[in-house]
């Protein structure tokens, strides 16, 4: 299948380039120069301008009167100006503002709590399975298997800290080497980026909002995937992460530190622990092949226990089996020895909803998964709604300028690095990269933060989560200190290496362009967002896992042809965009491929047919259902009943927008179809009533 949908036969103009700063959008050339074309016809060669590969601009030459979909929307203030209000109006306005702030903080609180419960739900549903992934002996020899296990486990438990703590305990117990643990940590880094991608799906109701939110969320995914793509082979070949971290750990004589400060958890824990409490040791025990743990429930029942260490006398077949020669005797009939045992006495039960239900983990997990997703979605909608009403006119202008404006020349380049520090600091405060990036997603969606600014914030978040892990490692007991610190440092240096790869030079900021490309596709074909999520976080890792279990030969036998095809397609695209004349006429565009291999249109028809029943019986009772409905059926009319997904885009359906050259390594060699309708038509997607 061709790498991106609707790959046209547009040719670059070799004589002319449109230069532009990385973060800026070039002005669209004159429309008259362009030639429109349809899907499957051999259209005449189009003369268009080629953007430099470091540009984050889309490859769509839209009509000049149309706004760039990536430009931040202007949030108009329709209300009465402050100066025009009377005293009563001013007081009312002030209290409204205070009320909105309280509501915003309230919804934000429940949003973070729902993320925590979502993580618990995932652990209940897939935690034991996740633990069993770790007990696979092939991890030691197969870094690729380690990587996908890291992805799958983190996706299943919705927490990179859980999966890394399992890895730490396995390394401490010598069940895993640091070398084998590094790919798992890389995988955990990928897995943790699913949370904000799920959050982005909640903004599916508004195309332009969804475009930005989804791109803003997936910039994290692409950064992690690309970093692994480059750094895993480097690590396997050189073991640089292992060597650097080993030198650091050995050169310092660390003393056990304080526990990593729980800042956000202090506020959220009182609420979340009333919903459910988990015994996370069970997953670790399963990972460490503890047979008893497989029958244990993850739902914590007893919160107050008394542990009494005592020695009990046990019979042994002969005195040779004694635990210690000095602790051995016979009573003339049986041989006895002393064994140290720990008696656990349950004192007080936990106080959460599920403590007395005795439901299986899967049932509790499913209930919590549905409820947390509903709360998450509801809170997100309300946050977006409140922010939308607050961030209007002058307020929006000030905030947008503060966040998105660069430092004055010649220090403009420093802005991004400051954003990285801010992202790291904020993540350190909230103690979770998932929480920080998930909170960032709706802000990108409503247009408060640009993707260009969100990118360094996300990178900083990746660093922030590792500093928390380093602090936690320093607080771990003596036997686990070395391994946990080395793993935390591996995580840290992996992210630093990734930033050095994909941030300093604007040309290398591939994750931004890839995310924008995916944002464009997903805005047009909203089902593709779910498809992307399933493919990248479940199917690819599970396929690699399955092939790895079958053995190296099978993995290489299947993997090499797949990698070869991908490289072939990328090389072909490179030649098509850079020097198409060296290619035979047939290979100068993708028209030689059947439509289903180069366009999402036929697939869209299939999905539309498959979800046709949802269009007829679309549940539009509430905004939450509506969003899910819109995502499934991708239909403009399905939710008209409650004006939730009002979509005035049919008028533009017939129009076409000329395509620019298929830029190298850009997800943006896409036509009108992937670009989606113009945002002007999407301005009224907010629910008028809940």
């Amino acid at each position: 299948m061709a790498p991106w949908p609707e790959l046209g036969d547009a040719q670059p103009n070799p004589d002319k380039y449109l230069e532009g700063a990385a973060g800026q959008q070039p002005t669209a050339p004159d429309k008259s120069k362009e030639t429109n074309k349809t899907d499957n016809t051999e259209a005449p060669v189009t003369k268009i301008e080629l953007l430099p590969s470091y540009s984050t601009a889309t490859l769509i030459d839209e009509p000049t009167e149309v706004d760039d979909p990536w430009n931040l929307p202007t949030l108009q203030d329709s209300g009465i100006k402050w100066s025009e209000r009377d005293t009563k109006g001013k007081i009312l306005c002030f209290f409204q503002g205070i009320g909105r702030l309280i509501l915003l903080l309230g919804f934000l609180y429940f949003f973070v709590c729902s993320l925590d419960i979502l993580s618990s739900a995932f652990q209940l549903v897939g935690g034991k399975m996740a633990g069993q992934f770790f007990s696979n002996s092939s991890i030691m020899s197969n870094p690729l298997l380690g990587l996908v296990i890291g992805v799958l486990v983190t996706v299943l438990v919705q927490s990179s800290s859980t999966s890394t703590s399992i890895v730490v305990s396995m390394v401490s117990s010598s069940l895993l080497t640091v070398r084998a643990a590094i790919p798992i940590i890389m995988g955990a880094n990928i897995g943790t980026s699913i949370t904000n991608t799920i959050v982005a799906l909640m903004q599916v109701g508004d195309r332009s909002e969804f475009r930005r939110a989804f791109a803003g969320a997936t910039v994290h995914d692409f950064f992690n995937w690309l970093s692994v793509l480059v750094l895993l082979p480097v690590e396997v070949a050189t073991h640089y992460l292992e060597i650097i971290t080993q030198l650091i750990v050995e050169s310092f004589h660390f003393k056990n530190g304080e526990d990593a400060p729980d800042l956000l958890k202090v506020i959220t824990k009182p609420f979340t622990k009333l919903i459910v409490q988990l015994d996370k040791k069970v997953i670790s025990q399963i990972a460490m092949n503890d047979e008893k743990a497989k029958n244990k429930s993850l739902v914590k029942i007893w919160c107050k226990t008394f542990t009494n260490k005592t020695q009990i006398n046990v019979t042994v077949p002969s005195t040779a089996n004694c635990t210690s020669p000095s602790l051995c005797w016979t009573d003339g009939i049986q041989n006895w020895t002393m064994k140290n045992v720990t008696y656990k006495e349950n004192i007080a039960k936990c106080q959460h909803i599920f403590v007395n239900f005795h439901l299986p983990d899967l049932a509790v997990g499913t209930i919590l998964l549905i409820l947390s997703l509903l709360v998450l979605c509801g809170c997100l909608i309300m946050i977006v709604k409140i922010l939308g009403s607050v961030l209007k006119g002058q307020v929006a202008t000030v905030i947008k300028k503060t966040i998105n404006t660069d430092f004055p020349f010649p220090f403009a380049w420093l802005t991004g690095y400051l954003a990285i520090l801010v992202g790291a600091g904020m993540t350190f405060i909230v103690q979770s990269s998932s929480v920080f990036t998930s909170a960032l997603t709706p802000l990108i969606g409503i247009g408060v933060i640009t993707i260009e600014r969100a990118y360094p914030l996300t990178l900083g978040s990746n660093i922030g989560t590792t500093t928390t892990a380093i602090l936690a490692a320093l607080a771990s007991p003596g036997n686990a200190l070395r391994s946990s610190l080395q793993i935390a440092l591996c995580h840290f240096f992996f992210n630093i290496s990734g930033i050095l790869l994909w941030y300093p030079i604007p040309f290398t900021r591939l994750p931004i362009r890839m995310a924008k490309g995916l944002g464009n596709i997903s805005a047009k074909y909203r089902w593709f967002a779910v498809f992307y999520l399933i493919i990248f976080f479940f199917l690819i890792p599970l396929t690699v896992f399955g092939l790895s279990l079958a053995g190296w030969r099978v993995l290489v036998g299947v993997g090499v042809p797949v990698v070869f095809i991908i490289i072939l397609v990328l090389c072909l695209r490179l030649l098509q965009s850079r020097c198409p004349r060296v290619l035979p006429k047939k290979l100068q565009n993708w028209n030689f491929l059947p439509l289903w291999m180069r366009s999402l249109k036929p697939w869209d028809a299939v999905v539309s047919k498959f979800t046709g029943c949802f269009q007829m019986r679309c549940c539009c009772c509430c905004r939450v259902c509506c969003r899910a409905c819109c995502l499934l059926c991708d239909c403009p009319k399905c939710c008209r009943c409650s004006k939730c997904c009002e979509d005035l885009e049919e008028a533009q359906e017939g129009q076409d927008v000329p395509v620019k050259a298929p830029e190298t390594f850009d997800n943006i060699t896409i036509s009108r179809e992937a670009q989606g309708e113009v945002p002007a038509s999407d301005s009224k997607t907010e629910c008028t009533a809940l």
Epitope: N313, T315, T319, P325, S326, L327, C328, W329, T330, D331, G332, I333, N335, W336
Partner: antibody, heavy 120, light 107 residues
């Protein structure tokens, strides 16, 4: 009060058998092992064997296998030792003693002893 | 079988003296050793078990020590009621074996 009350002295002919009893009181019979010890010539002690009344499991010193047979009756809290094919060598004082099952506290209570005299 | 040896069949002492009765096992028995006191015409009575643990009701003047193969029963401030036979017993492996005994008597 812990008590191990043994049956009275026995005067028996060679080649015959004798059954000595050890009636216990003041403790849970089934939680203990009842051992039998031989003391001849008023000096050295020799372990014969032991029985776990709870399940009837026994063990004997090699040279007493076939010579001694240990039994226990849980209902009457009594242990028995039968000595077969008696010879003058078997003339001695026989003691029963209790040992707490699963503990290393040794033989903490003894019976008063039963004197067996083998004489024609 | 483990052979338990009590080298002194007789030991003479004076009232109020300190006396040490020794016992040697033919192989390592850890601390699985007990000491019994038997007065003439009476049944044996447990004094010390697990080499050094005093049985309930036993006066503090009786102390046990040792591990492995060499063990000692020490009586400080010998009283007239302490004049008796003393047996050591190993219970490391079956069969249980006793020493021949040491008779404590007045000088």
């Amino acid at each position: 009060e812990v008590q191990l009350q043994q049956s009275g002295p026995e005067l028996v002919k060679p080649g015959t058998s004798v059954k000595i009893s050890c009636k216990t009181s003041g403790f849970f019979f089934t939680e203990y092992i009842i051992h039998w010890v031989k003391q001849s010539h008023g000096r050295s002690l020799e372990w014969i064997g032991g029985i776990i009344p709870n399940n009837g499991v026994t063990n004997y010193k090699q040279n007493f296998r076939g010579k001694a047979a240990l039994t226990a009756d849980k209902s009457s809290n009594t242990a028995y030792m039968e000595l077969r094919s008696l010879t003058s060598e078997d003339s001695a004082v026989y003691y029963c003693a209790r040992w707490r099952n699963g503990y290393y506290s040794a033989m903490d209570s003894w019976g008063q002893g039963t004197s067996v005299t083998v004489s024609s | 079988d483990i052979v338990v040896t009590q080298s002194h069949k007789f030991m003479s002492t004076s009232l109020g003296d300190r006396v040490s009765i020794t016992c040697t096992a033919s192989q390592d028995v850890g601390t699985a050793v007990a000491w019994y006191q038997q007065k003439p015409g009476h049944s044996p009575k447990l004094l010390i078990y697990w080499a050094s643990t005093r049985h309930t009701g036993v006066p503090e003047r009786f102390t046990g020590s040792g591990s492995g193969t060499d063990f000692t029963l020490t009586i400080t401030n010998v009283q007239s009621e302490d004049l008796a036979d003393y047996f050591c017993q190993q219970y490391r492996t079956s069969p249980l074996t006793f020493g021949v005994g040491t008779k404590l008597e007045l000088k």
